[in-house]
Interface confidence: low
């Protein structure tokens, strides 16, 4: 679709005569008829296949024609066409004399023709005017012409239809050749595809408008490059969505089981050394002078009964001092000046001479100890309590106070986490060093088999277009991670439908 435009500029008829030579009375009131048709080697009569147009009376005899285009007038003359411009044409311009006001052909005398010119040739679509002048013996006509495309038509033949648009079907303006030029922030054949925020992850992010970055399920962050860990993941991270990879010192499905109680809680006091011994369990090795599960109790140095052979212990600011009984000497009263002849063994102990009678050794009966069998046996001396249990003397017996998670006379037994039957729906319980594990029957899941599940949500391969399926363990539903170019809960839709009608 386009327009052939003809701009009449000047007509000269100095003598004011008709084509027949007869003069016009009082002068030649001149109007023009224009016929545009297909190319003919010899321009001949016949239908004006590309259109016709007539002017009103433009002047008398000789006159210049005013450019009226800005005021909505009729110069240049417009010959619209609704087909592909062929590039060639024939043009007939007739100048007529109008004796009266009726310009219809049938109202004019047959000899009212002043002049007739016919041209033919090729003409490309363009903004530039072609200037021409045709002279006969009596008249001269100066004019120019061009072909331009109608609004929304482009290309060498005005055959390319293009309307600028900025909606669901495209975001573009039209170039002179009719090709699309995308508006800023849009790309693709029809400028339908938004250009996402710079750096937006190609697979994990997408956008519905420019400079946006919307995350696919399982991803987060401004650029959708951070995975979302499993719902409930406490001390863990992920490298793909819904994972829960535990930080150092944490364990369990949700990384909520403390495997490094020492570091996270620092339970040992007074400079003691802490050792992890299982989930939420630890052992403190006390520095000299301290005792208790957490080395929280300060020891008197005499509490360890350092004085032997019945020596009495005196606490001092910088330690202790042993007061030895008669016949003994040394820091701990460990040296004897006695021999078996002095009956040094108490509580029925038997005396044995050593080093040719220079000193002796007592062999003590049960329940007594010491160099001279002078001490009742302290049942806690051998530290019989296992797993960090605290030994307590209770009269003639002893007992172990066990730390959480242990039981038995000597704290030698783990408390069975399975004793409480924690696995629901008939799950089988397994005691582990750091807790327990439930093996669930078909149809149930969760740490304690508490979640009812029909089947693995991904088992039916619900995701399309080679998307990755993840089972969300907290809801037992599936999530599809779409490959680039697809969206939808099952990745079933291509991103961005091309346009309908791009204008």
């Amino acid at each position: 679709s386009g327009v052939f435009q003809l701009q009449l500029q000047e007509f000269i008829n100095e003598r004011g005569v008709l084509a027949s030579g007869r003069p016009c009375e009082p002068g030649c009131r001149t109007f023009f008829r224009v016929c545009l048709k297909h190319f003919q080697a010899v321009v001949s009569p016949g239908p004006c296949t590309f259109g016709t147009v007539s002017t009103p009376v433009l002047g008398t005899n000789s006159f210049a024609v005013r450019d009226d285009s800005s005021g909505g007038g009729r110069n240049p003359l417009q010959l619209p066409f609704n087909f592909t411009w062929p590039g060639t044409f024939s043009l007939i311009i007739e100048a007529w004399h109008a004796p009266g006001d009726d310009l219809r052909p049938e109202a004019l005398p047959p000899d009212a023709l002043i002049s007739k010119i016919a041209i033919q040739g090729s003409l490309a679509v363009g903004q530039n005017w072609l200037l021409d002048e045709q002279t006969s013996t009596l008249t001269r006509l100066r004019y120019s012409y061009r072909v331009i495309c109608s609004d929304n038509y482009y290309g060498d033949n005005c055959s390319r239809l293009c309307k600028k648009r900025n909606d669901h079907f495209g975001h573009y303006v039209c170039q002179p050749d009719g090709n699309l030029s995308c508006l800023p922030g849009w790309t693709g054949e029809y400028c339908q595809q938004p250009i996402c925020l710079s750096g937006c992850h190609e697979q994990n992010g997408y956008c519905s408008k420019p400079a946006e970055c919307l995350c696919r399920p399982g991803w987060q962050g401004r650029l959708c490059n951070e995975c979302i860990p499993h719902n409930g993941c406490r001390h863990g991270t992920c490298s793909t969505p819904w994972q829960c990879t535990c930080d150092e010192g944490w364990g369990g499905l949700f990384c909520d089981q403390d495997l490094n109680y020492c570091t996270h809680h620092s339970p040992c006091k007074n400079g003691a050394t802490c050792s992890n011994s299982g989930q939420r369990s630890y052992t403190c090795t006390c520095r000299p002078g301290y005792t208790g599960v957490d080395c929280e109790l300060e020891l008197s140095e005499c509490d360890s009964n350092p004085c032997r052979n019945g020596g009495s212990c005196k606490d001092q600011e910088d330690g202790y001092h042993c007061l030895c009984p008669p016949g003994y000497y040394g820091l701990h009263c460990e040296h004897s000046t006695l021999s078996c002849a002095d009956s040094p063994c108490f509580n029925g102990g038997s005396c044995r001479e050593r080093n040719q009678g220079a000193n002796y050794a007592c062999e003590c009966p049960p329940n007594f100890t010491g160099s001279n069998c002078e001490k009742k046996v302290d049942r806690c001396t051998s530290n019989p309590c296992a797993n960090g249990g605290q030994c307590l003397n209770r009269g003639p017996s002893r007992m172990c106070r066990c730390r959480p998670g242990f039981t038995g006379t000597y704290c030698e037994l783990h408390v069975s986490d399975c004793a409480r039957n924690p696995c629901a729906h008939g799950g089988t319980c397994h005691d582990l060093e750091n807790g327990l594990m439930c093996t669930c029957p078909a149809g149930f899941s969760g740490r304690r088999c508490e979640v009812r599940t029909s089947i693995d949500a991904c088992a039916s391969s619900p995701c399309f277009n080679r998307a990755t399926c993840y089972t969300d363990l907290s809801t037992d539903t599936f999530v599809c991670n779409c490959p680039y170019g697809f969206v939808g809960s099952r990745c079933e839709f291509p991103v961005g439908l091309p346009p309908s009608f791009p204008w």
Epitope: L161, N166, P498, W503
Partner: antibody
Amino acid sequence: QVQLKESGPGLVQPSQTLSLTCTVSGISISIYGVSWVRQPPGKGLEWMGGIWGDGSTDYNSALKSRLSLSRDTSKSQVFLKMNSLQTEDTAIYFCTLSGDFDYWGHGVLVTVSS
Amino acid sequence: DIQLTQSPASLSASLDEIVTITCQASLDIGNWLAWYQQKTGKSPQLLIYGATSLAGGVPSRFSGSRSGTQYSLKISKLQVEDTGIYYCLQHYRAPFTFGSGTKLEI
């Protein structure tokens, strides 16, 4: 000049399938989309669906389960298939160039009756 | 789906009068609204596209305007040939939707 012409049966039995063809000339349907619009007697216009330049489709939510659009670009034809017809599907069916819808066919009257 | 609420359903006016028909969109559809005139037994004819642009060959007494999500078609100096039903259409997002129509009698 752009022209669109609908063709198909004027009478369809209830519960049967309607098949209509829209023949487009003067423009390429592999670039421009074609929509179907219908108008029951004495009622307003209803957009049924469209098939776009690349062959992808969109449908009116209420007709989605029954409606299918396809095309043959070599013949410049767009096809409408709608199943399970009822008397309320009696209407004039127009095809139109999608976008501003400034080119329309004359429409074809389809009567659903036994 | 985007709804278009068109009003009034019908109106009667005299020659040379001015009438206004409105269409309210349920969502922001930008300028992607068109107005059509349909005469009895004929296909709809595009009057206004892009909310405000006059289609080719349509008299200048027809004009379109927009205020937020409300769109208006104004016809000044009514002529006999303006009798017909007028529809609005949103083509911002598929599924596209038409207004319910306004019947204009002169």
